[in-house]
């Protein structure tokens, strides 16, 4: 069953800056992501950004930059102009639509205990996006490495070791987490097998696109910049969550920039490559 996770992060260097990270753990092909605040989209929430895997992104103040991080996760940077920092008490929701199967949404907020002065130690948890063998191998190595490091710390410094938890921390940012999986079994968050599914749809899908969204030009594929660039390299500087991909996507970030009617396309907009034969040509 699909899962949606939401994580809200406050920048330690700029206390007025927030980033919302969202991801989809499921077998479907994402057709649209909507980020809202104040509640779920369509249920009292206000849209902050809409990210379409082909047509680009559209955002509204106070959203500063919305972008795809991987084929199944996005991030939205927010600029809090108010001195009272209203974001600290705001609920952010992310809705992942997989047309026509359904839409899944989850919400999260900045934990009230967030204190920029207390920086949590980095917790290396990789984004698992490679094949299953890579996943298992990488996990084993990292777990062993973490265990060994903790063992050394325990022996040498004789002090309690920090509890491992998913987070987005590095030298630049303090992560304040809002872990909000969907109501499906939480076992999927701990057991990679729980989110591995076969192809969601057969090759005979009868899915048509609107005439209003004309066929899009194809440009040379480009690789994403930043920590999500490599699908085979673990991200150690920034903790993340287990994200088992469907296996039918191409490498993360292979997204030619496109524009569509009424959509503002940002330079770093990228997302899942359309997979023909699953939901038709997008």
């Amino acid at each position: 069953t699909p899962e949606v996770w939401v994580q809200v992060q406050m920048e330690a260097t700029e206390l007025s800056s927030f980033t919302v990270h969202c991801g989809f753990l499921g077998p479907g092909s994402i057709s649209l992501v909507t980020v809202s605040w104040g509640g779920p989209d369509g249920a009292g929430g206000t849209k902050l950004a809409v990210l379409h895997p082909e047509l680009g992104t559209r955002q509204w103040a106070p959203a500063r930059q919305a972008r795809w991080e991987t084929q199944s996760s996005i991030s939205l940077a927010l600029e809090d102009s108010g001195a009272s920092s209203p974001f600290a008490n705001t609920t952010f929701c992310c809705k992942f639509a997989s047309f026509p199967e359904g839409s899944w949404e989850s919400c999260g907020s900045l934990p009230p205990s967030s204190d920029p002065g207390l920086s949590a130690p980095p917790t290396p948890v990789p984004i698992l996006r490679a094949d299953l063998a890579g996943i298992l191998g990488l996990s084993g190595v990292l777990l062993f490495g973490c265990g060994y490091l903790l063992h050394l710390l325990r022996r040498q410094k004789h002090r309690p070791t920090p509890r491992l938890q998913p987070s987005h921390t590095n030298s630049q940012a303090l992560t304040a987490q809002a872990w909000a999986p969907s109501q499906a079994s939480q076992a999927a968050l701990h057991d990679p097998y729980a989110t591995i599914n076969t192809s969601f749809c057969p090759a005979t899908l009868d899915t048509a696109h609107p005439n209003g969204w004309a066929s899009l030009p194809t440009h040379a594929a480009h690789q994403p910049q930043g920590p999500a660039a490599s699908a085979s390299t673990p991200i150690l500087a920034r903790g993340s969550f287990v994200s088992v991909e469907n296996g039918l996507y191409t490498q993360a970030g292979e997204r030619p920039p496109h524009t569509g009617p009424g959509l503002t396309l940002f330079p770093d907009c990228r997302g899942p490559r359309a997979v023909e034969g699953r939901f038709g040509v997008r």
């Epitope: 509640g39 369509g42 249920a43 809705k95 047309f99 199967e101 359904g102 109501q183 969601f200 048509a208």
Partner: antibody, heavy 122, light 106 residues
Framework: EVQLVQSGAEVKKPGASVKVSCKAS????????IYWVRQAPGQGLEWMGT????????SYNQKFRGRVTMTRDTSTSTVYMELSSLRSEDTAVYYC???????????????WGQGTLVTVSS | QNVLTQSPATLSLSPGERATLSCSAG?????LHWFQQKPGQAPRLLIY???NLASGVPARFSGSGSGTDYTLTISSLEPEDFAVYYC?????????FGQGTKLEIK
């Protein structure tokens, strides 16, 4: 209050076409997909297709391929389902429904139209 | 298409009894939805994603299952529960419903 109001009953001859409307109110029309289900007398439910009201994308049951067309008019918050080349076995109640969004810790609700009876008879 | 087979076709029980309705898929599905339909009315979402209660649905309803076998359970039948129940899969196109289980008063 969320409402889906469908057009009235229709009697059609074999080979003709029928266009059923579904007018939505009480929510932002483009925030939710609409799907169509039909139910022949005394029979079960049959999914016909889904339309994404925000971008007009559609997905149809291949059983109706080439015969069904779903459209939407955002100015009137109305979705239309047209079925052509009607035959007697198309006699059924046709329902439109607002697709639900599965949201954690929030109520998940679906809404349905009252149904439109389409009778195909010579 | 993925055929969903519901059993039994008809279930005759009395108020207060426990009802168990089954839905078997021809091929594995990721999750299942259950709908309730009363005569002359449109269907109503009862359980989504296998085991989650839709808004306003009493806690006596529960769902379970995985793969190809799913179950809807009503712990203690109330008079208003007698209706037709349909399961639906959305794991592959076309989406399909089971043929329905009619729950009638004994």
């Amino acid at each position: 209050e969320v409402q889906l109001v469908q057009s009235g009953a229709e009697v059609k001859k074999p080979g003709a076409s029928v266009k059923v409307s579904c007018k939505a109110s009480g929510y932002t029309f483009t925030d939710y997909w609409i799907y169509w289900v039909r139910q022949a007398p005394g029979q079960g439910l049959e999914w016909m297709g889904t339309i994404d009201t925000s971008d007009h994308k559609t997905s149809y049951n291949q059983k109706f391929r080439g015969r069904v067309t779903m459209t939407r008019d955002t100015s009137t918050s109305t979705v239309y389902m047209e079925l052509s080349s009607l035959r007697s076995e198309d006699t059924a109640v046709y329902y439109c429904a607002r697709d639900f969004i599965i949201t954690v810790n929030y109520p998940v609700v679906d809404y349905w139209g009252q149904g439109t009876l389409v009778t195909v008879s010579s | 298409q993925n055929v969903l087979t519901q059993s039994p076709a008809t279930l005759s029980l009395s108020p207060g009894e426990r009802a168990t309705l089954s839905c078997s898929a021809g091929s594995s599905v990721n999750y299942l939805h259950w709908f309730q339909q009363k005569p002359g009315q449109a269907p109503r979402l009862l359980i989504y994603s296998t085991s989650n209660l839709a808004s306003g649905v009493p806690a006596r309803f529960s769902g379970s299952g995985s793969g190809t076998d799913y179950t809807l359970t009503i712990s203690s039948l109330e008079p208003e529960d007698f209706a037709v129940y349909y399961c639906q899969q959305r794991s592959s196109l076309p989406f399909t419903f089971g043929q329905g289980t009619k729950l009638e008063i004994k």
